[in-house]
Amino acid sequence: SEVEYRAEVGQNAYLPCFYTPAAPGNLVPVCWGKGACPVFECGNVVLRTDERDVNYWTSRYWLNGDFRKGDVSLTIENVTLADSGIYCCRIQIPGIMNDEKFNLKLVIKPAKVTPAPTLQRDFTAAFPRMLTTRGHGPAETQTLGSLPDINLTQISTLANELRDSRLANDLRDSGATIRIG
């Protein structure tokens, strides 16, 4: 069954999806849609990339990671309860029936008046890769932790770690990216 992600009303929601390009810049088309992945396409498309760039997007939906390195995780800005539901990430790998498709369930909770959570000390142990946050200036990149490569078979593991995405939301609000490659 699909992996579940949570966010609060008014926050940014983060839905992870990754692939490993065959070579740097050798991208494959990816689409994100609202609703479960159909047999060939992506449902009601909210964002689409081609071999070069993001070529279609709708307001509030964007890729905050480096999609040129295979991070096609979706950020949904300022979510409302209506954003709850299933989302489809489809990696349209060329060839016969090579598509990778992932159904992710987004659960939006009413906003709570609680202090923002802080980064936990064991965060780097859970994520093998490089994680950065970016401030508002070009020189404000801070390495939070170093962590092996993520491939398609490891997506679910990463997804499970991010399941309760309060932390992910805080990172995304400050421009966090999980870098691939």
Partner: antibody, heavy 119, light 111 residues
Framework: EVQLVESGGGLVQPGGSLRLSCAAS????????MSWVRQAPGKGLEWVAA???????YYPDSVKGRFTISRDNAKNSCYLQMNSLRAEDTAVYYC?????????????WGQGTLVTVSS | DIVLTQSPATLSVSPGERATLSCRAS??????????MQWYQQKPGQAPRLLIY???NVESGVPARFSGSGSGTDFTLTISSLQSEDFAVYYC?????????FGGGTKVEIK
């Protein structure tokens, strides 16, 4: 107005090859999955190939390795290359547009082109 | 592969009468609460025409006398009052899994 026009059908000997074309107009071709569906004389419908908007390819076992579907978004066209043709491939071949956002069912069809495989 | 079995193979109906066509799938075509089953109409010498998608949604431009129902493995196309232009062959089709498959068809003929 959405239009799909097939061409390239004809008589071919067993073991031969044929390339069918489907010229599309009236919609943003690149956003849609396209399929080929065939109908043998007096028989039912059989799906034979699909290509997604992103270029992923899908075939049933009956034609896998013999048929190749492709698309040229710049020319608003879809193609079906048919090799190692058999008598049982004789049929009217329809080009069909997959429903936007899904692709697995067909909201527009061409009028079909007849392929006859016979010696 | 998902096998679709349509019944009856031929249905003889008088104009103005109700026609009920059946399609049974060899396995469920339910997917996240949606039944991935379609119905098409085909007249001699013409291409098929989409009538119903996702089991019960009537395609734009299709007369209201056509309706679809069912879930899981059992589906029905109903024509509430047959008109002369409705005499044709009707096919069901699943979009749950590759390969996409069609039923063998039901021919609706004038009684």
């Amino acid at each position: 107005e959405v239009q799909l026009v097939e061409s390239g059908g004809g008589l071919v000997q067993p073991g031969g090859s044929l390339r069918l074309s489907c010229a599309a107009s009236g919609f943003t071709f690149s956003r849609y999955a396209m399929s080929w569906v065939r109908q043998a004389p007096g028989k039912g419908l059989e799906w034979v190939a699909a290509i997604s908007s992103g270029g992923s390819l899908y075939y049933p076992d009956s034609v896998k390795g013999r048929f190749t579907i492709s698309r040229d978004n710049a020319k608003n066209s879809c193609y079906l290359q048919m090799n190692s043709l058999r008598a049982e491939d004789t049929a009217v071949y329809y080009c069909a547009r997959g429903r936007e956002a899904d692709g697995g069912y067909f909201d527009y069809w061409g009028q079909g082109t007849l392929v006859t495989v016979s010696s | 592969d998902i096998v679709l079995t349509q019944s009856p193979a031929t249905l003889s109906v008088s104009p103005g009468e109700r026609a009920t066509l059946s399609c049974r799938a060899s396995e469920s075509v339910e997917y996240y609460g949606t039944s991935l089953m379609q119905w098409y109409q085909q007249k001699p010498g013409q291409a098929p025409r989409l009538l119903i998608y996702a089991a019960s949604n009537v395609e734009s431009g299709v007369p209201a006398r056509f309706s679809g129902s069912g879930s899981g493995t059992d589906f029905t196309l109903t024509i509430s009052s047959l008109q002369s232009e409705d005499f044709a062959v009707y096919y069901c089709q699943q979009s749950m899994k590759v390969p996409l498959t069609f039923g063998g068809g039901t021919k609706v003929e004038i009684k």
